[in-house]
Amino acid sequence: MMTGTIETTGNISAEKGGSIILQCHLSSTTAQVTQVNWEQQDQLLAICNADLGWHISPSFKDRVAPGPGLGLTLQSLTVNDTGEYFCIYHTYPDGTYTGRIFLEVLESSVAEHGARFQIP
């Protein structure tokens, strides 16, 4: 039975040209996290395997940095980066847990700075 829950940064916003940290946290389970996949709708951004390290998709390699931890740092944000992002936790023995983050990239400097994991 899957008892875990994923906490995410929820809905966040950031300024165009800036950076943001996408972060999820799996709690309430003793399952072992074997891998976390970061995806944006139908695209793979990155994979962090607990043992094998990171894979960054070539289309994002210049704008994505691994970490901190199992999180992902998105850099040089554009308005096109607005949308849903998913952290997919592969665990043993539970299976797969998915968390959702919605990122809004704003043109102006009125981006909210309330997100827990956001880079100023």
Epitope: I47, L52, G53, H55, I56
Partner: antibody, heavy 119, light 107 residues
């Protein structure tokens, strides 16, 4: 240039163990994950597992968990794959191969080591 | 485990032909797919990574496409030196798995 040079062919009896080595040169062994892939005669490639020499993490295919052991001697720039409790179905060519920097595709391969298990 | 089904298993074509090989994953793997070429008695060589990126030094006649579960590998104009077996490989999640291979022969 990057090179992965493997140890020579081995003939083993069922129940025995084999240890294959893979000497890396042309790059720093701790910078790339090393994997082991085998190919039985006429069969598809089969991933055994991988080891991250930087932090020592290992990931094994469930099929080989407990029977395969991956290690790295960073001072000798050499990776090892030991397979125990050998059976005839383990007769195959064993390859070491490294994954690209920050990618999981396998960009350099050793020449392969033939392991024959026969009584 | 993710199953990779490659087709056809063998293929005979003439020099200059356009050759297409397909690979189907048993679940969505996004673009976590590579293609390799293996000649008899030799180790595989990386041709395509992340579904569509040509590896360094690989001739432009080789290309890859696809995302999700369906992938295609194409040789735009077959050359005699392309005679080999081609494999797809998923690295979306462990255990990493390979297709059954496509053996390419010249007519």
């Amino acid at each position: 240039q990057v090179q992965l040079v493997q140890s020579g062919a081995e003939v083993k009896k069922p129940g025995a163990s084999v240890k294959v080595s893979c000497k890396a040169s042309g790059y720093t062994i701790t910078e790339n994950t090393m994997h082991w892939v085998r190919q039985a005669p006429g069969q598809r490639l089969e991933w055994i597992g991988g080891i991250n020499p930087n932090q020592g993490g290992t990931s094994y295919s469930q099929k080989f968990q407990g029977r395969a052991t991956l290690t790295v001697d960073t001072s000798a720039s050499t990776a090892y794959m030991e397979l125990s409790s050998l059976r005839s179905e383990d007769t195959a060519v064993y390859y070491c191969t490294r994954s690209s920097y920050y990618r999981y595709d396998l960009d350099y391969w050793g020449q392969g080591t033939t392991v024959t298990v026969s009584s | 485990d993710i199953q990779m089904t490659q087709s056809p298993s063998s293929l005979s074509a003439s020099v200059g032909d356009r050759v297409t090989i397909t690979c189907q994953a048993s679940q969505d793997i996004k673009t976590a797919l590579a293609w390799y070429q293996q000649k008899p008695g030799k180790a595989p060589k990386l041709l395509i990574y992340s579904a569509s990126y040509r590896y360094t030094g690989v001739p432009s006649r080789f290309s890859g496409s696809g995302s999700g579960t369906d992938f295609t590998f194409t040789i735009s104009s077959l050359q005699p030196e392309d005679i080999a077996t081609y494999y797809c490989h998923q690295h979306y999640t462990t255990p990493w798995t390979f297709g059954g291979g496509t053996k390419l022969e010249i007519k």
